[in-house]
Interface confidence: medium
């Protein structure tokens, strides 16, 4: 017997060939499919691990498998030697026996061989299956490990580039902060210099203010002297008038009687036959106290008592409570008639208030209130208005309900600020409200974007300072 060979046929069965002289014996053995060793069970539906087993563990197990393989190989070789030895013995026996017994002997040998080979093959197949199973599992684990490593490498690279970017950004920001710090230091220096300059300026202004105060004191003294002179002059004029009226009454007794008639308002003056615009002397209700007022005997039927006029900025309207109470200015020009007189007058009977306005573009507008009166001084000359009509806005620019009157020394507004000081002039300020006809007078081309000008919001907005204003009253039944 010369040769012993194992191979695979086309349909996957294992072949064992034995060559003996001119005779060749082929044994076809069935495949032992799905044969698993009980020592290492294979679970087909096992859940795959998220991460591969430790690499060292895999290597160790591979070495164990290699050892098993080596042992199997040696064992197979021993088996082959044993078979060959047996075959030799049997062949000698066969040769000694008659040729006719050869077939029977061969069948017996074949059977023995087949049984032994089948047993060995089964064991070998089991081992092969185990090795294949383990190898496949190791390959999968290695693949997973490789993939996981690649993923981690990519993440590390991404993070590294992100860190680099952040470092770049950080250094850029650091530079920017340093630049800003430098700029801030320069600005602080500049502010300090400006502060020093301002302090110098303030001290200069303080000295100028002191000088002005001295001048004001001097002017006040001079003014007092002038007032006394004026008073004396007025007395002289009155004496002369009295002398003249005495001499006239001697000639014409009817004239003397007419001179003694007193007028409460311009409506009474108008009704008495005086229909010319001008300054007239009016008497306080239930009193002999007199006041000079301008009467408009032409506009809207005449009989209007002018209680305020602005037209050229010749009179300062930033006055005290007392001045607004008794009146100031010149009745033929800019003036305020006086809150006390207007309060007393408008509480005697029902009056209407007409406010006539002019802008710098030649436009005119008016607001007419059907009912107007002022409370007493105890109630801060609070304004009361009803029934607005006119062309200077459909909403009242004098806040409703009416507010108390405020001046620079009498703050009665609804603002935490002092509207009269801030916006200048005495007015029925709210907080501070949509109007102030006693504000600063601004000439043309300087009259816009002024918060403290002569304002009537619902006609011209908050920043427009008007050219001229007139406030006039007349009995409602005129």
């Amino acid at each position: 017997y010369n040769n012993f060979r194992k191979s695979m046929d086309s349909i996957g069965k294992k072949q064992y060939q034995v060559q003996h002289g001119s005779c060749s014996y082929t044994f076809l053995l069935p495949e032992m499919d799905n044969c698993r060793s009980s020592s290492s069970p294979y679970v087909s539906n096992a859940v795959q691990r998220d991460a591969p087993l430790e690499y060292d563990d895999s290597v160790q197990r591979l070495q164990v498998l290699e050892n098993i393989m080596e042992n199997n190989t040696q064992w197979l070789m021993k088996l082959e030697n044993y078979i060959q030895d047996n075959m030799k013995k049997e062949m000698v026996e066969i040769q000694q026996n008659a040729v006719q017994n050869q077939t029977a002997v061969m069948i017996e040998i074949g059977t023995n061989l087949l049984n032994q080979t089948a047993e060995q093959t089964r064991k070998l197949t089991d081992v092969e299956a185990q090795v294949l199973n383990q190898t496949t599992r190791l390959e999968l684990q290695l693949l997973e490990h490789s993939l996981s490593t690649n993923k981690l490498e990519k993440q590390i690279l991404d993070q590294t580039s992100e860190i680099n970017k952040l470092q770049d950004k950080n250094s850029f920001l650091e530079k920017k902060v340093l630049a800003m710090e430098d700029k801030h230091i320069i600005q602080l220096q500049s502010i300090k210099e400006e502060k020093d300059q301002l302090q110098v300026l303030v001290s200069k202004q303080n000295s100028i203010i002191e000088e002005l105060e001295k001048k004001i004191v001097t002017a006040t003294v001079n003014n007092s002297v002038l007032q006394k002179q004026q008073h004396d002059l007025m007395e002289t004029v009155n004496n002369l008038l009295t002398m003249m009226s005495t001499s006239n009454s001697a000639k014409d007794p009817t004239v003397a009687k007419e001179e003694q008639i007193s007028f409460r308002d311009c409506a009474e003056v108008f009704k008495s036959g005086h229909t010319t615009n001008g300054i007239y002397t009016l008497t306080f209700p239930n009193s002999t106290e007199e006041i000079k007022a301008y009467c408009d005997m032409e506009a809207g039927g005449g009989g209007w008592t002018i209680i305020q006029r602005r037209e050229d900025g010749s009179v300062d309207f930033q006055r005290t409570w007392k001045e607004y109470k008794v009146g100031f200015g010149n009745p033929s020009g800019e003036y305020w008639l006086g809150n006390e007189f207007v309060s007393q007058l408008t509480n005697q009977q029902r009056y209407v208030l007409k406010i006539h306005l002019k802008d710098w573009e030649g436009n005119e507008a008016y607001s007419l209130y059907e009912h107007f009166y002022l409370s007493s001084e105890e109630l801060n000359y609070r304004i009361h208005l009803k029934g607005l009509t006119g062309t200077a806005g459909k909403i009242s620019s004098i806040s409703q309900p009416g507010n108390d009157f405020s001046t620079k020394d009498g703050d009665n507004d609804k603002c935490i600020c002092k509207c009269s000081q801030m916006l200048t002039g005495g007015w029925w300020f709210d907080a501070c409200g949509p109007s102030n006809l006693n504000g600063m007078y601004y000439p043309q081309r300087q009259n816009t974007n002024k918060f403290n000008g002569i304002k009537w919001y619902y006609w011209k907005g908050s920043g427009y300072s008007l050219k001229a204003t007139t406030m006039m009253i007349r009995p409602a039944d005129f």
């Epitope: 459909k394 949509p434 918060f451 403290n452 619902y458 908050s462 920043g463 427009y464």
Partner: nanobody, 120 residues
């Protein structure tokens, strides 16, 4: 609190039209003058138009006169700006603003703005 919210902006072709709205809340809308102001990209604020409290008086910048119309609906507390014959130079963020009583012609409250882009 006082709030002004503009809407109606968007992309429009030259010669096209848009109507901007400004919804007001937190104050008596009918008592205040209202304005539209715009800011072109990289430029300063430019006054566009104003309307008085009752809508009877309006005024416009020369650059928009005859093309833009300001109006208001006091019942709905809303200010409008109808923009016709739009040009590329009208591209800007448009703000509505309230003129306060004592603000000296300035604006005491502004909206957040709405972008108008005029492009072919």
């Amino acid at each position: 609190q006082v709030q002004l919210v503009e809407s109606g902006g968007g992309l429009v072709q030259p010669g096209g039209s848009l109507r901007l709205s400004c919804a007001a809340s937190g104050f008596t809308f009918s008592s205040y003058w209202m304005h539209w102001v715009r800011q072109a990209p990289g430029k300063g604020l430019v006054w566009v138009s104003r309307i008085n409290s009752d809508g009877s008086s309006t005024s416009y910048a020369d650059s928009v006169k005859g093309r833009f119309t300001i109006s208001r609906d006091n019942a709905k507390n809303t200010l409008y700006l109808q923009m016709n014959s739009l040009r590329a130079e009208d591209t800007a963020v448009y703000y509505c603003a309230r003129e306060g009583y004592s603000s000296g012609g300035q604006f005491d409250y502004w909206g957040q703005g709405t972008l108008v882009t005029v492009s072919s």
